[in-house]
């Protein structure tokens, strides 16, 4: 190889070892029979050299640096050439560096030809290996503006006082043009301006200078976004840190066309604007930092540009002014995205403050709109607290657990509506009475309705899940000892049509000691499957539950247990089951940790099944599944 650099070229070539590899044999640059691992060629020099190995690209890299001085003479503006031409260089990973020094009063603009640039962050890389690294200067300090790949939206970067631009090309890349030009501009009076041009739907992730390290103190950086008029843009902050300010406040400023309050000033922790039509600017302004403990300011954000959806032009009113202790959250449902560009899905408050989720609280009327390609990507979760603080006032009081009709007017699916029912400890208990009798969901007889009620204890220290219940069964009521949460969970969009089947009344009743009592009136046509709470995890220690099973006069009930033995092993206490005839009060007691469960048995009258747990050994829990069937009486055995 021969590299000759003209004396006035201001170009220096450096060949040096790249990243250490585990290659068995090293490689050297050979210059007139001398071996070296570094070669520097300066302007006016001509050097002949070879490599001592067949694949020098596995060992060496080449840096070509051109210093451009705009301080002492005219600046060579226009398209930047790759010099020396890549065809004259050895096939090594190459980095072309242009170091432009200019006066503070002169703005320098880097213009990138199509495909434009895409900024990438720490730990990422470019698919084709072609990387642009751009730095600026503040006095003597170098500031990293960012590293970029091809195929993005960044079309121009304006700086002042100088630019250091590095273009990295892998050894196998055929590229022979720089892909950018330099122009002079008037002073920009800030660190830099990055222009990002969208021609259609898409997204861009951008970062503050020096990211992930700190943005320079008291500096200003601006991003200009060029957006087609028919599209909408939304900004979301992916990651940010605030420094410790002594004077002034760190902030972002938006210049939004048509806004009457330009510039709109936001804190970094605020929700950022969305649903913006047309071009806009975003500026990051630093502050004077505390000299002793400066901290760091940094920002990584995303701009998402997409078509406005039909729904985004509608305003929905959510009236929670008459509700108490209620919160409504609209959020993304958890799904794996496979498409490359996924349009954003935002819910907007007052059409401007858009975010991926939104929580509305009771006591106010809220106006919301959507900026989303497909509203099935969102769902709604509602929480409502119903509490009783004075047991004398609440006793026998009833509340309807019904989803308010207002919610059905919203274009997103309801996922969960949770009622937290809170009672004074050891004073009152609760009874749930459904509009339609309920079926307990079991593997043997799963619910196939569009919604279910999930009933669980709402006492933080207690892990007790009574089960999942849907309309169309035999459970007439569920009594629970203390605080519970009842969650109406929907499973299909058809819930809107089936909404009339929902309806549960909760009443506050005198306190009782059992954890739960289920009142069951079996249907003559089908088996009723019942199982102990906390199925698969075991009934909690020392917990007692009962089933009050009604047997009509003309029927006989058959009680069948799924297993021969419960498998429970008690560490302390005893686990037992009592089956009691309600008419005669005759009862049988079974030791669940010792005895076999009873064989199928017939009951001619209503009866109780009561199960009380011990403190089981780990892994040897108490789980019981049983069923009841009715058959007509053939002979009167009273």
């Amino acid at each position: 190889f021969e590299i000759a650099l003209p004396r006035e070229s201001n170009i220096t070539v450096l060949i040096k070892l790249g990243t250490p590899t585990l290659l068995a044999k090293p490689c050297y640059i050979v210059i007139s029979k001398r071996h070296t691992t570094m070669l520097s060629i300066k302007p006016g020099e001509r050097i002949l050299f070879t490599f001592s190995c067949q694949s020098p690209e596995n060992h060496f890299v080449i840096e070509i640096q051109k210093n451009i001085d705009c301080m002492s003479g005219p600046c060579p503006f226009g398209e930047v050439q790759l010099q020396p031409s890549t065809s004259l260089l050895p096939t090594l990973n190459r980095t072309f560096i242009w170091d432009v020094k200019a006066h503070k009063s002169i703005g320098l603009e880097l213009q990138f030809s199509i495909p434009r640039l895409r900024q990438f962050g720490p730990g990422e890389s470019c698919p084709d290996g072609v990387t642009y690294s751009i730095s600026g200067r503040i006095d003597a300090t170098v500031v990293r503006i960012g590293t970029f790949c091809s195929n993005g939206t960044v079309s121009r970067i304006k700086m002042q006082e100088g630019v250091k631009m590095a273009l990295h090309l892998p050894w196998f890349h055929p590229r022979n043009v720089s892909g950018f030009s330099i122009a002079n501009r008037s002073s920009i009076k800030r660190l830099c301006i990055i222009e990002s041009v969208f021609e259609g739907e898409g997204s861009a992730t951008l970062m503050s200078a020096n990211y992930p390290e700190g943005f320079p103190e008291d500096e200003l950086m601006t991003w200009q976004f060029v957006i087609p008029a028919h599209l909408r843009a939304s900004v979301s902050f992916l990651n940010f840190n605030l420094s410790n300010c002594e004077r002034k406040e760190e902030r972002v400023e938006y210049y939004i066309p048509g806004s009457t309050t330009n510039p709109e000033v936001f804190k970094l922790e605020d929700k950022q604007p969305g649903n913006m039509a047309g071009n806009f600017n975003l500026s990051l302004q630093g502050c004077d930092q505390d000299a002793q403990n400066p901290g760091i300011l940094r920002l990584q954000f995303q701009v998402l540009v997409q078509h406005p959806q039909n729904e985004s032009n509608k305003i929905y009113v959510v009236d929670l002014s008459n509700e108490r202790a209620t919160s409504l959250t609209i959020e993304p449902r958890p799904v794996k995205q496979s498409r490359k560009f996924v349009p954003g899905c935002f819910v907007c408050l007052e059409s401007r403050t858009c975010s991926t989720n939104l929580t509305l609280t009771s006591g106010s009327k809220h106006k919301i709109s959507f900026l989303c390609d497909n509203l099935t990507r969102l769902w709604m979760n509602v929480e409502k607290n119903i509490s009783c603080t004075d047991h004398r006032y609440c006793q026998r009081k009833s509340y309807s657990l019904q989803v308010p009709s207002d919610i059905f007017h919203l274009p997103v699916e309801l996922h969960d509506f949770s009622w937290k029912l809170l009672v004074p400890k050891d004073r009152l208990s609760l009874v749930l009475v459904p509009a339609q009798k309920l079926q307990q969901h079991t593997h043997e007889k799963p619910c196939n309705t569009s919604f279910s009620y999930l009933v669980a204890s709402a006492i933080p220290s207690q892990d007790l899940y009574f089960g999942s219940f849907c309309p169309g069964g035999s459970i007439e009521q569920i009594q629970v000892k203390q605080n519970i949460s009842v969650t109406l969970r929907t499973f299909a969009p058809s819930f809107r049509q089936e909404a009339s089947r929902q309806g549960l009344t909760v009443s506050f009743i005198p306190y009782f000691k059992e954890e739960g009592v289920f009142t069951v009136t079996p249907d003559t046509k089908s088996k009723v499957y019942l199982r102990t709470p906390n199925w698969d995890r075991g009934l909690p220690s020392l917990t007692s539950v009962s089933w009050n099973i009604s047997v009509p006069r003309d029927q006989v009930a058959c009680l069948t247990f799924f297993k021969e033995r419960t498998g429970v092993v008690c560490q302390t206490g005893r686990a037992f089951m009592i089956i009691q005839e309600q008419r005669t009060r005759a009862e049988e007691i079974f030791s669940l940790d010792e005895d076999a469960l009873p064989k199928p048995r017939f009951h001619h009258h209503s009866f109780w099944v009561n199960i009380s747990n011990c403190s089981p050994a780990s892994g040897k829990q108490l789980d019981l599944l049983f069923w009841v069937t009715l058959t007509p009486r053939t002979v009167d055995l009273t």
Epitope: T36, M38, S40
Partner: antibody
Framework: EVQLVESGGGLVQPGGSLRLSCAAS????????MHWVRQAPGKGLEWVAS????????SYADSVKGRFTISADTSKNTAYLQMNSLRAEDTAVYYC?????????WGQGTLVTVSS | DIQMTQSPSSLSASVGDRVTITCRAS??????VAWYQQKPGKAPKLLIY???SLYSGVPSRFSGSRSGTDFTLTISSLQPEDFATYYC??????????FGQGTKVEIK
């Protein structure tokens, strides 16, 4: 695994001689440059000499030129430093190092004490 | 011979501090500068080669840079295991190798 083990250090009188050895394993010294670097007690590092076995090229610090000789036996994968006319100021820990990505592997060092 | 003038000769710093050590070459050595870390009683360890390339296995808090004949080693956030002596060295192929005088980084 690359390893360098120095030996041959010890106590010697001024004007005496010593031969230090550096046994390399995990790589072939034929392909690399081998270096000796020393460190006097409580002082900084001082490069002493280097050899490139593939070309036979040697280089010395001015302070040892004419008194020290660096050599290598590629069949034994070992580098040597022959030290003659030793002086009190040659007292130091002598390290052997491999040269490629600068001095990328070092031995644990051997102590040479020149004293009467 | 080329002189490598290293400064400061010692410095006190706390865990988490950003530490900068500089070396000035008496003439151009291109980017042929390395930085080493040495702990008492141990052999030096290579941190940086070719002025700014991080040697494999070295934590990314260490970085090197060059501006003409001035070379800088930066530790972005000092860790307890970083208290040691640091040396710069030029290894430009036309000249004998030379080290800087060393910088001792001590706990404040």
């Amino acid at each position: 695994e690359v390893q360098l083990v120095e030996s041959g250090g010890g106590l010697v009188q001024p004007g005496g001689s010593l031969r230090l050895s550096c046994a390399a394993s995990g790589f072939n010294i034929s392909y690399y440059s081998m270096h000796w670097v020393r460190q006097a007690p409580g002082k900084g590092l001082e490069w002493v000499a280097s050899i490139s076995p593939y070309s036979g090229y040697t280089s010395y610090a001015d302070s040892v030129k004419g008194r020290f000789t660096i050599s290598a036996d590629t069949s034994k994968n070992t580098a040597y430093l022959q030290m003659n006319s030793l002086r009190a100021e040659d007292t130091a820990v002598y390290y052997c190092a491999r040269g490629y990505y600068a001095l990328d592997y070092w031995g644990q060092g051997t102590l040479v004490t020149v004293s009467s | 011979d080329i002189q490598m003038t290293q400064s400061p000769s010692s410095l006190s710093a706390s865990v988490g501090d950003r530490v900068t050590i500089t070396c000035r070459a008496s003439q151009s050595v291109s980017s042929a500068v390395a930085w080493y870390q040495q702990k008492p009683g141990k052999a030096p360890k290579l941190l940086i080669y070719s002025a700014s390339s991080l040697y494999s296995g070295v934590p990314s808090r260490f970085s090197g840079s060059r501006s003409g004949t001035d070379f800088t080693l930066t530790i972005s956030s000092l860790q307890p295991e970083d208290f040691a002596t640091y040396y710069c060295q030029q290894y430009y192929y036309f000249y004998p190798f030379t080290f800087g005088q060393g910088t001792k980084v001590e706990i404040k």
